[in-house]
């Protein structure tokens, strides 16, 4: 028994004076606590306790369930203990079958012994199955068997406490180990859409998916820069033992412009936190914004192709699109498609394919688009570049030579004189009159130019060339002259 120096409070003394006592089932347990300041006896086994205010604890007919730790405490709070085993061959184990373990922590299989002298106190798998190879345990007859560093793989493991008694193996009731996983990574969070665009009054609903090893992961929707509690609804599922998924749905039944902003889905566990955001934009009404992908004034050569391309933002979705030329609607030659297949896409592309354009097909091409809220349009002015064409070349009654040419851009007409039989006409002749005539065709059509020279200036046989040209090309017409005496005669003009 402990001894202390006089004057200092000492712990109580217990008789019998030993740390452990073994009695047989049916025998008497008699424990005496000696202390002038005796307060109580306390009995403990498997977290259950019992108290006795008498200084002598007597159990006349001991049962296996009387196995446990008996502690005597005095008024100074000092105590002394004795552990009593009540040996009962028919009940070798006391058990608390609830068995829960946290991953990586130790957990106690609560099967204390009633007889410390049995051998081979250990764990065994149910139905003769072996225990996991890496399962380590430490037996303690007074407490049970401690499983060291519980693994996730032990979840739902069925086991027994086991001892050898008289050469035979005796098993306790079965235990099923439930393992609560430890968080070893932050939760995985994702959101149904990264951005939302709504009109006032429409419902905003966004779902955050949180994935983790257990349902004790915390999650919430927050509005950035706001403390307002948001209305959210949860659903969750266990996909197997350590694969938990929660869906947290945030809803604003009638969104307002001032609800616009960034919403964060936040999740955390004991390892750390993760978040994902979504942006809400609420507009008072829909809109359409058109962006031409090429210049709205287009120059194209005769016979070539051109694509008129626009991108446009439309919210809500576009309902009607059309391309128009000269009050006529194109039924084909155009296509309209979303810029991306993303569900939140509001950007679209429309293309009009003009092929082998003729000089007569210049003009204004208009793209029109509408949705339930607004209409919008954009016009392209298309000019078809054409090589000059000489429409007429005549000798007029007043002796003028006249050349009329049409083309786009506006042709320039130059005159040349070729003396005698020379093939090259190099000497230029200044025109007397140049006029740009109004075309009777559609706007954006060919431009007509008329140029005249005075034929009386020519004194020798030769050829006069009328040359019309622009950026696209050139065309010439010729007048042949021959003199008979003093008379000049125009031979047939030719090109």
């Amino acid at each position: 028994q402990p001894s202390v120096s006089p004057g200092e409070p000492s712990p109580p003394s217990i008789h019998p004076g030993k740390s452990d006592l073994i009695v047989r089932v049916g025998d008497e347990i008699r424990l005496l606590c000696t202390d002038p300041g005796f307060v109580k006896w306390t009995f403990e086994i498997l977290d259950e306790t019992n108290e006795n205010k008498q200084n002598e604890w007597i159990t006349e007919k001991a049962e296996a369930t009387n196995t446990g730790k008996y502690t005597c405490t005095n008024k100074h709070g000092l105590s002394n203990s004795i552990y009593v085993f009540v040996r009962d061959p028919a009940k070798l184990f006391l058990v608390d079958r609830s068995l829960y373990g946290k991953e990586d922590n130790d957990t106690l299989v609560r099967c204390p012994l009633t007889d410390p002298e049995v051998t081979n106190y250990s764990l065994k798998g149910c139905q003769g199955k072996p225990l996991p190879k890496d399962l380590r345990f430490i037996p303690d007859p007074k407490a049970g068997i401690m499983i060291k560093s519980v693994k996730r793989a032990y979840h739902r493991l069925c086991l027994h406490c086991s001892v050898d008694q008289e050469g035979k193996s005796v098993l306790s009731e079965k235990f099923i180990l439930k393992v609560r996983p430890a968080f070893k990574a932050v939760p995985v969070v994702s959101v149904s859409k990264a951005s939302y665009l709504l009109r006032e009054g429409e419902e905003f609903t966004v779902t955050c998916t949180i994935k983790d090893v257990s349902s004790s992961v915390y999650s919430t929707w927050k509005r950035e820069n706001s403390q307002t509690k948001l209305q959210e609804k949860y659903n969750g599922w266990h996909h197997g033992d350590f694969n938990y998924e929660r869906q947290a749905t945030l809803t604003i039944s009638s969104a307002r412009v001032n609800d616009s902003g960034v919403f964060m889905c936040y999740a955390n566990n004991t390892f750390g936190s993760a978040n994902v955001t979504t942006t809400l934009e609420v507009v008072d009404k829909g809109f359409i914004n058109i962006f031409p992908m090429i210049n709205t004034t287009v120059f194209v050569n005769d016979g070539e192709n051109v694509d008129l391309i626009v991108e446009y933002e439309a919210f809500p979705k576009p309902e009607h699109q059309q391309w128009i030329y000269m009050n006529r609607t194109f039924t084909d030659k155009w296509e309209d498609y979303p810029k991306s297949e993303n569900e939140s896409n509001i950007r679209y592309v429309s293309e009009l394919h003009l092929t082998r354009l003729k000089g007569t097909e210049g003009g204004t091409y208009t793209f029109l688009v509408s949705n339930s809220d607004v209409n919008a349009a954009i016009a392209f002015n298309v000019y078809v570049n054409t090589k000059p064409e000489i429409l007429t070349y005549d000798r007029l009654v007043n002796g003028m030579l006249q050349c009329v040419a049409a083309g786009f851009p506006e042709p320039t007409i130059d005159w040349y004189f070729c003396p005698g039989t020379e093939q090259r006409c190099s000497a230029s002749v200044l025109p007397v009159d140049v006029q740009t005539l109004n075309s009777s065709g559609p706007p954006f059509g060919k431009l007509v130019v008329q140029s005249s020279i005075d034929s009386s200036a020519f004194k020798h046989n030769g050829t006069v060339e009328c040359k019309a040209y622009n950026d696209v090309g050139k065309t010439s017409a010729y007048f042949n002259f021959a003199f008979k005496g003093n008379n000049k005669e125009q031979i047939h003009p030719h090109t």
């Epitope: 019992n50 609830s98 946290k102 099923i176 609560r180 599922w237 996909h239 938990y244």
Partner: antibody, heavy 123, light 107 residues
């Protein structure tokens, strides 16, 4: 034996405060969670919240958060449920219960129940 | 919060009958479900924990099954002392909600 003994019935007026108790015995009080459950007359059971006397960690149902306070005195093995301002709708039977072994109050179940405390709030 | 829906809300049966009560969770709760019995004027009593584990001292005619969202309490042969109200409770995540209860009455 293991038991939870609750304080006696209480009759109060609206606006008054009240603290009811639940004393545990026969087991190591600090090693188990203690929960509180409400049962309004003729109705079902409602989980209010839970406390771990060992460190006073407390978890509340959102329906009761801010309405009641759960506390514990571990040296006297007692858990408490209190109201600062009672309402007529607080009239109910209140049970305390021990949450059998689990982890952090999950899993397991309420294996030991108190006898209940009837709280009547009437003007 | 996880909602638990019990069905039926009440039933009439005779002594010796096999009785089945179901509890459906609004989301998966693994096997974290308990069943309680409550008699008028008494505190509830634990029958089953972890969906299928029989509490010590509870007669073996009571059994529990299920996992995930659907759970069942079965009384294999109803005894006179079994007429009571039965509640399920999930202990998978906070708040630890109860079902609405099933009253088992004498036919």
């Amino acid at each position: 034996q293991v038991q939870l003994v609750q304080s006696g019935a209480a009759v109060k007026k609206p606006g008054e405060s009240l603290k009811i108790s639940c004393k545990g015995s026969g087991y190591r009080f600090t090693s188990y969670w203690i929960g509180w459950v409400r049962q309004m007359p003729g109705k079902g059971l409602e989980w209010m919240g839970i406390i771990y006397p060992g460190d006073s960690d407390t978890k509340y149902s959102p329906s009761f958060q801010g309405q009641v306070t759960i506390s514990a005195g571990k040296s006297i093995s007692t858990a408490y449920l209190q109201w600062s301002s009672l309402k007529a709708s607080d009239t109910a039977m209140y049970y305390c219960a021990r949450h059998g072994r689990g982890y952090d109050g999950y899993e397991g179940a309420f294996d030991i129940w108190g006898q209940g405390t009837m709280v009547t709030v009437s003007s | 919060a996880i909602q638990l829906t019990q069905s039926p809300s009440s039933l009439s049966a005779s002594v010796g009958d096999r009785v089945t009560i179901t509890c459906r969770a609004s989301q998966g709760i693994s096997s974290a479900l308990a069943w309680y019995q409550q008699k008028p004027g008494k505190a509830p009593k634990l029958l089953i924990y972890d969906a299928s584990s029989l509490e010590s001292g509870v007669p073996s005619r009571f059994s529990g099954s299920g996992s995930g969202t659907d759970f069942t309490l079965t009384i294999s042969s109803l005894q006179p002392e079994d007429f009571a109200t039965y509640y399920c409770q999930q202990t998978n995540s906070y708040p630890l909600t109860f079902g609405g209860g099933t009253k088992v009455e004498i036919k």
